[in-house]
């Protein structure tokens, strides 16, 4: 069964800067990746970036840089201050869509005990939704 993993890391150099990494563990062809915060995309979450494998990348503040790391993983750097800045308990969600086969989504947040800049290697997160 395909799975999605999410890793959230706070940068040691800038405490208002977060890096979100997401990956898809499956054999399907990815048609779109959506990254949101505050909950799943379309269910109260706010879209930060969408990445299409052929047509490009769109991102919205406070997203600073979204990019493909591999054919099945992406990373997103967030930085902000004030109202648009993420906080330590913010939930980030990544959704990998393979149209029309299905979509898989998982969410994660900064580990409460982790030091800035340090985090465990990514582990598969539970699938929140699979169409």
């Amino acid at each position: 069964t395909p799975e999605v993993w999410v890793q959230v890391r706070m940068e040691a150099t800038e405490l208002s800067s977060f890096t979100i990494r997401c990956g898809f563990l499956g054999s399907g062809s990815i048609s779109l990746v959506t990254v949101s915060w505050g909950g799943p995309n379309g269910a109260g979450g706010t879209t930060l970036a969408v990445l299409h494998p052929e047509r490009g990348i769109r991102q919205w503040a406070p997203a600073r840089q979204a990019r493909w790391e591999t054919q099945s993983s992406i990373s997103l750097i967030l930085e902000g201050s004030g109202a648009s800045s993420p906080c330590a308990n913010t939930t980030f969600c990544c959704k990998f869509a393979s149209f029309p086969e299905g979509s898989w989504e998982a969410c994660g947040s900064l580990p409460p005990s982790s030091d800035p800049g340090l985090s465990a290697p990514p582990t598969p997160a539970p699938i929140l939704r699979a169409d």
């Epitope: 048609s31 779109l32 959506t34 995309n41 379309g42 269910a43 879209t47 969408v50 299409h52 047509r55 490009g56 769109r58 959704k95 869509a97 149209f99 029309p100 979509s103 169409d131």
Partner: nanobody, 120 residues
């Protein structure tokens, strides 16, 4: 959870008409774009038509002048009026919600699809 439910498909003779409907729920309807994709038997996916958040409709060349896309925000519904249907319009039609990349509406959510068969 986002839900898109299509209806209105069926069997129709060449030259006939059908109206597809899509009932949407579970998301903010004023999204980037909504539209219709189709997949003919043994063929790839094709974007048929979509409508932007500003209400501007866009069509693939092969359906221009025959198909009309519209949306009703009050009813959270999307429609595709298909006239002068041809055998090559036979396909599973998917209602999609997505994000714009230029003139392309990239599907982020979609329904189960409804089959349209054009045959005499």
């Amino acid at each position: 959870e986002v839900q898109l439910v299509e209806s209105g498909g069926g069997l129709v003779q060449p030259g006939g008409s059908l109206r597809l409907s899509c009932a949407a729920s579970g998301f903010t309807f004023s999204t980037d774009c909504m539209g219709w994709f189709r997949q003919a038997p043994g063929k790839g996916l094709e974007g048929v038509a979509h409508i932007d958040s500003d209400g501007i409709p866009r069509y693939v060349e092969s359906v221009k002048g025959r198909f009309t896309i519209s949306r009703d925000n009050a009813k959270n519904s999307l429609y595709l009026q298909m006239n002068s249907l041809r055998a090559e319009d036979t396909a599973v039609y998917y209602c999609v919600v997505g994000f714009k990349f230029g003139d392309y509406c990239a599907p982020n959510d979609w329904g189960q699809g409804t089959m349209v068969t054009v045959s005499s």
